[in-house]
């Protein structure tokens, strides 16, 4: 069905006309004007950003722009105490220290406020004692390193290199292993791509470039000191030693030449194999401490950052719905950076910006979308997802009745090789349809549907012809959206080659080199991929407000379902003699699904033949369709993250920014040969595997004729 | 109880390659190393290279020029060690040896390298 | 490559008696060494880690110490079942290299 029916207007304003609206040089005047001088949250030069994001919007044509603010935990270094890292000799003399700063960009010396390498939330001390090197700090490394190696981290200070996982991952792991310090590097084997120059000649990390970041483990929380509520003026806050996720012990983050300068004196053991060596001319040895004539040098971390409840402030534009105003999609993204926000987060802001002055000129003509849309511009983003969640726990009521799907919108680019995909599965079809609408933009495709370029260089796993679609995890502003509420959300950005780089993220990812002209020079220089990720986006957006019948297939989630129970199922079967001891069986799990199943297909064809014309009858399908995402929620959580509600999806419990399938089940399961009491153990999993039934069963019956 | 069980005796002629197996169980395979050593007649032991058996990742002793490959098959927990080019000094008794410190062996495996 | 001396080549002591076993590394390795049994017609079993740690089931008679380049191993009270060859090891840097051995026997 065409778009244009949902209104009564004439056919110009149909998706087309939304898509021919975005410009690509629009697109590139926004990211320069967004990427001047840094917007650091609860900074004045932030909120002055919202003000004129707020006015902007006002003028695009939305029907109303209004700024909420917050007031939540943030961590800035002390302006007259910074923090650095140390060797010390036996008598307590600094004999090396790291760089206080990155040497700031051509064209960038003169700008003020740029904030340090810090690891945001860290808390105060000055450690010092030996170093125990611990490659990525996964659950595996530390498995590797206390039960197959017996080296014990204990009143140690690690060293880790960035990627692979969520920074808040490892400094949890760090600290449950007993370390009293955590040193973060980004290492040139994951963050230094192969024939690539340095930024500014490339876009490659230098050797005193670093990677700022949150070490927060949230799961969920938002601000830390008012979980489950909004930080508003009558807020109760917890005390700081109550507040959520805060890490216990001091951390800091240093670039491949400090980093060159500790490792190369390590001692002790060998790695113990290939996957722990990185790109620096060192041994990597694992420690403890540093080799023969250093044995007596120690580190010492000096840190000194401090805690502030501070004002944040995001922007909520509405375009009100002609016929469905109380249905709401929402289209959201961060505003607030590290520092300049080349690409994280204004490469995304600057197409949301678009989006909007698209919506509104169409608005101008007379035109409205079918249901509400609501644009955000997040505060606080990288202090924990702290606008997001507060302005979600403050409408969660609204919300959870009306909430119809989240598009998130952070950088539109992570690399220029092909599109990237998170999405709801009840989105597989959307975007399926959707890319093969659009051109693709990629070098070789001239022609060909953005859909051919995207399944040609990322192509699924499991469906020959079609497109690697992935879970969704976290570390973005859709976490409450979709975790916490279950309301249908979908992320996309234009990515790199995973197969050639192997790099973690992008090089320059959170650094001051993180420019406009970064972009402007190396990523995208016409912009293309930027318009490429709006039409995606915004036609994503268009669809889900303006379509008649909503745009999602639930067939597409039994299939899912299938696919994770059998994973599940696979995992535990590593166990058979446990299964058969505690009497495990996956059966009711496997029933549901097949029930789901057999529900979404009758479903899918009573979607086909039902009176459209008759609005009450379009309204219950819609809403089953609406309230499919929400059935998969348990209200009471996952065990020890209340926050993360959804059954089917949660964050990785040792990745935040990975997804998980069944994560009750996953995690009951997980290390599971090494529980104490083994009967325990496997009641829990089989307890999971109630919850996960239950909430399939219970799910699929939504999608029945309701009477 | 930990065991890891090597493959039988093999006798191979000069230029031939061997692939001996080390099946273990009684611990959770992807979490100890696999080392392999050798120890030829009377001599003491020679360190071969090892494997993590949940990333694949290897090392190594130069020593052996690219001769030596260690390949790991999760799911039944069997570890190998293919040794290539073989000539007579290679006869020896072959191991592995599973943790990073060596904490359980094989009970090796008889190589004879003869024309 | 690490090269790792063992002294003496052989060892006589009588029962109950204390045998001392002595390892040279040729840089330093910290702690990063590691003592092995070897009876005739047996594998190898590892004895102590990391220089001074039992391994699990090694009677308290075996003794580790050492660190940098020096180690040693002691057997307080020798037993009629610790005639073996010995092995130390260093896990400081690839290749991982082991001594020679020594062999102890009862006088």
């Known amino acids: 069905k065409s778009s244009n029916e949902a209104t009564n207007i004439t056919p110009k304003h149909n998706m087309k006309a939304f898509l021919d609206e975005l410009k690509a040089e629009n697109i590139k005047k926004f990211l320069y004007n967004f990427t001047q001088i840094p917007h650091l949250a609860g900074t004045e030069q932030n909120f002055q950003l919202a003000k004129q994001i707020q006015s902007q919007w006002k003028e695009f044509g939305l029907d109303s722009v209004e700024l909420a603010h917050y007031d939540v935990l943030l961590s800035y270094p002390n302006k007259t105490h910074p923090n650095y890292i140390s060797i010390i000799n036996e008598d307590g003399n600094e004999i090396f220290n790291t760089s206080l700063f990155e040497p700031p960009p051509p064209g960038y010396e003169n700008v003020s406020d740029i904030v340090p390498p810090f690891s945001a939330f860290s808390p105060q001390g000055m450690p010092e004692g030996d170093l125990v090197y611990v490659n990525y700090a996964r659950t595996e490394d530390f498995f590797k390193l206390e039960r197959d190696m017996k080296i014990n981290c204990s009143g140690k200070i690690v060293i880790a290199r960035y990627g692979k996982v969520f920074r808040g991952n490892k400094v949890k792991n760090a600290q449950l292993a007993g370390a009293k310090g955590v040193i973060l590097y980004s290492d040139p084997a994951d963050y230094f791509a192969p024939g690539v120059k340095s930024y500014p000649d490339g876009w490659n990390l230098p050797g005193g470039g670093v990677q700022r970041g949150n070490i927060l483990n949230l799961n969920g929380a938002g601000d830390p000191l008012t979980p489950g509520y909004p930080a508003n003026e009558y807020a109760y806050r917890r005390g700081i030693a109550e507040a959520v996720g805060l890490p216990s012990i001091p951390v800091h983050p240093i670039g491949y030449y400090d980093a060159q300068k500790l490792l190369e004196k390590m001692g002790g053991s060998a790695p113990p194999d290939s996957s722990w060596r990185g790109s620096l001319k060192v041994p990597y040895n694992v420690g403890p401490g540093f080799t023969g004539n250093f044995s007596t040098q120690k580190v010492k971390m000096h840190i000194h950052s401090t805690n502030e409840v501070t004002r944040i402030y995001n922007v909520i534009g509405t375009l009100r719905g002609a016929v469905e105003p109380d249905r709401y999609v929402i289209l959201g993204g961060h505003r607030d950076s590290w520092v300049f926000g080349g690409i994280d987060p204004q490469s995304g802001a600057a197409v949301v910006h678009e989006i909007v002055r698209s919506f509104g000129t169409l608005k101008k003509e007379g035109w409205r979308p079918r249901r509400t849309i609501l644009f955000a511009s997040w505060d606080a983003e990288e202090f924990g997802l702290l606008g997001s969640t507060e302005w979600a726990e403050e409408n969660s009521r609204l919300l959870q009745e009306r909430g119809v799907a989240y598009i998130n919108a952070d950088s539109s680019i992570e690399g220029n090789y092909t599109l990237r995909v998170d999405c709801t599965p009840l989105m597989y079809s959307l975007v399926h349809n959707l890319t093969k609408e659009l051109k693709s933009p990629d070098e070789g495709f001239e022609g060909k549907s953005l859909y051919e370029s995207w399944t040609k260089k990322s192509p699924s796993p499991e469906f020959s012809g079609m497109p690697r679609i992935s879970k969704l995890g976290s570390g973005n502003d859709f976490e409450v959206f979709f975790q916490r509420l279950g309301i249908a959300s979908g992320r996309a950005r234009y990515t790199k080659n995973w197969e050639t780089n192997k790099f973690s993220g992008y090089p320059l990812y959170h650094s001051v080199y993180e420019t406009y002209e970064l972009v402007e020079k190396f990523y995208d220089p016409m912009f293309k991929y930027h318009l490429t990720v709006a039409q995606v986006r915004g036609g994503m957006v268009f669809e889900l407000a303006n379509s008649i019948v909503l745009p999602f297939d639930c067939r597409d989630y039994a299939v899912v379902l299938r696919k994770y129970a059998d994973k599940i199922y696979s995992i535990s079967m590593k166990h058979p003699q446990e299964m058969k001891t505690y009497s495990v069986s996956f059966d009711s799990l496997f029933s549901a699904v097949k029930n789901f199943t057999e529900i979404a297909s009758k479903f899918s064809e009573r979607l086909q033949d039902f009176d459209k014309s008759n609005p009450i009858v379009l309204r219950m399908m819609n809403d089953q369709l609406m309230f499919l995402e929400r059935a998969f929620i348990d209200p009471l959580g996952l065990p020890d993250r209340p926050f993360y509600r959804h059954v089917i999806y949660a964050p990785s419990s040792h990745n935040k920014y990975a997804g998980e399938s069944f994560p009750g089940i996953y995690d009951a399961l997980f290390d599971i040969e090494s529980k104490v009491d083994p009967s325990k153990a496997w009641g829990e999993v089989k307890r999971q595997i109630y919850v996960a039934a239950f909430t399939v069963q219970a799910a699929a019956e939504t999608l029945s004729e309701v009477a | 109880e930990v065991q890891l069980v090597q493959s039988g005796a093999e006798v191979k002629k000069p230029g031939a390659s061997v692939k001996v197996s080390c099946k273990t169980s009684?611990?959770?395979?992807?979490?100890?190393?696999i080392h392999w050593v050798r120890q030829a007649p009377g001599q003491s032991l020679e360190w071969m290279g090892n494997i993590n058996p949940n990333n694949g990742g290897t090392t190594y002793n130069q020593k052996f020029q690219g001769r030596v490959t260690i390949t790991v098959d999760k799911s039944t927990s069997t570890a190998y060690m293919e040794l290539s080019s073989l000539r007579s000094e290679d006869t020896a008794v072959y191991y592995c040896?599973?943790?990073?410190?060596?904490?359980?062996w094989g009970q090796g495996t008889l190589v004879t390298v003869s024309s | 490559d690490i090269v790792m001396t063992q002294s003496p080549d052989s060892l006589a002591v009588s029962l109950g008696e204390r045998a001392t076993l002595s390892c040279r590394a040729s840089q330093d390795v910290g702690t990063a060494v590691d003592w092995y049994q070897q009876k005739p017609d047996q594998s190898p079993k590892l004895l102590i880690y990391?220089?001074?740690t039992r391994h699990t089931g090694v009677p308290d008679r075996f003794t580790g110490s050492g660190s940098g380049t020096d180690f040693t191993l002691t057997i307080s009270s020798l037993q009629a079942e610790d005639v073996a060859v010995y092995f130390c090891q260093q896990l400081n840097s690839y290749p991982l290299t082991f001594g020679a051995g020594t062999k102890v026997e009862i006088k």
């Open positions: 040896a599973a943790g990073w410190n060596f904490d359980y």
């Open positions: 990391w220089a001074s």
């Open positions: 009684g611990y959770t395979f992807t979490e100890y190393t």
